[in-house]
């Protein structure tokens, strides 16, 4: 016996109570594939979530976060607080980056400034809470009377720190 349910398109469900007739999904539900025996309940974007795309009979609603928060996880399953540049989010809220670290985004953690000396360079522009340091030429290149043909510092193998 042929399964009539396989003929039911997206946006409908196969109603066993009505001799496997394809019935439209009820309000606030959807089926994104054919041959479904039930429709799924639409996601509700409420509270800290706002609707980015309304639910239709064939696709779920898509949520975003209210201004001041950003999406986390697949399909914006969570909303997480934004911070200012120069801060990171902790359980106590947004906190300024400690000296020697920076964050140039509204999310994520404070990361240490680049250590220019590890690459044989000098600090050209100091770091701030919002910006990493800018490394410049090596100190030898900047010393008076230094030859412009100074050979480059030997390259380090990746994953090896200087002795």
């Amino acid at each position: 016996l042929q399964d009539l349910c396989s003929n039911c398109p997206a946006g409908t469900f196969c109603d066993n109570n009505r001799s496997q007739i394809c019935s439209p999904c009820p309000p606030n539900s959807f089926s994104s594939a054919g041959g479904q025996r039930t429709c799924d309940i639409c996601r509700q974007c409420k509270g800290v979530f706002k609707t980015r795309k309304e639910c239709s009979s064939t696709s779920n609603a898509e949520c975003d976060c209210i201004s001041g928060y950003h999406c986390l996880g697949a399909e914006c399953s969570m909303c997480e607080q934004d911070c200012k540049q120069g801060q990171e989010l902790t359980k106590k809220g947004c906190k300024d980056c400690c000296f020697g670290t920076f964050n140039d985004q509204k999310r994520g953690i404070c990361r240490p400034w680049t250590n220019c000396s590890l690459d044989g360079k000098s600090v050209l522009v100091n770091g701030t809470k919002e910006r990493d340091v800018v490394c410049g030429p090596s100190p030898a290149d900047l010393s008076p009377g230094a030859s412009s043909a100074t050979p480059p510092a030997p390259a380090r193998e990746p994953g090896h720190s200087p002795q």
């Epitope: 509270g47 928060y69 986390l72 399953s77 969570m78 909303c79 997480e80 989010l89 902790t90 359980k91």
Partner: nanobody, 123 residues
Framework: EVQLVESGGGLVQPGGSLRLSCAAS?????NYWMNWVRQAPGKGLEW???????????YYVDSVKGRFTISRDNAKNSLYLQMNSLRAEDTAVYYC????????????????SGQGTTVTVSS
């Protein structure tokens, strides 16, 4: 169905007090960090306070420290926000929100919240 329902908002004069409540259903409250967040008219969402699973850790945004107290009663599946010395700038829709799995470890994301309760502070 996982649900949070806030209540207790209203109109109050500056210097007055209100106690907001949040009733949780469809999940075990004692397994989750819980938060209060608010949205003032025309502004973005602002985190207000949070509390860990057993109530031993509580944190507040600077602007409400010493005036607001977050608490919970896991036996009653309820979260509270006692608001004292209210100011005009506390006028907002207040939402109760659950910290998602891994809150405080991997992230500080909120995965469920209610529809909100409106607090208006005006003379």
């Amino acid at each position: 169905e996982v649900q949070l329902v806030e209540s207790g908002g209203g109109l109050v004069q500056p210097g007055g007090s209100l106690r907001l409540s949040c009733a949780a259903s469809g999940f075990t409250l004692s397994n989750y960090w819980m938060n209060w967040v608010r949205q003032a008219p025309g502004k973005g969402l602002e985190w207000v306070a949070n509390i860990n699973q057993d109530g031993s850790e509580r944190y507040y945004v600077d602007s409400v420290k010493g005036r607001f107290t977050i608490s919970r009663d896991n036996a009653k599946n309820s979260l509270y926000l006692q608001m004292n010395s209210l100011r005009a700038e506390d006028t907002a829709v207040y939402y109760c929100a659950r910290g998602g799995e891994g809150y405080g470890v991997d992230h500080y994301g909120l995965d469920v919240s209610g529809q909100g309760t409106t607090v208006t502070v005006s003379s």
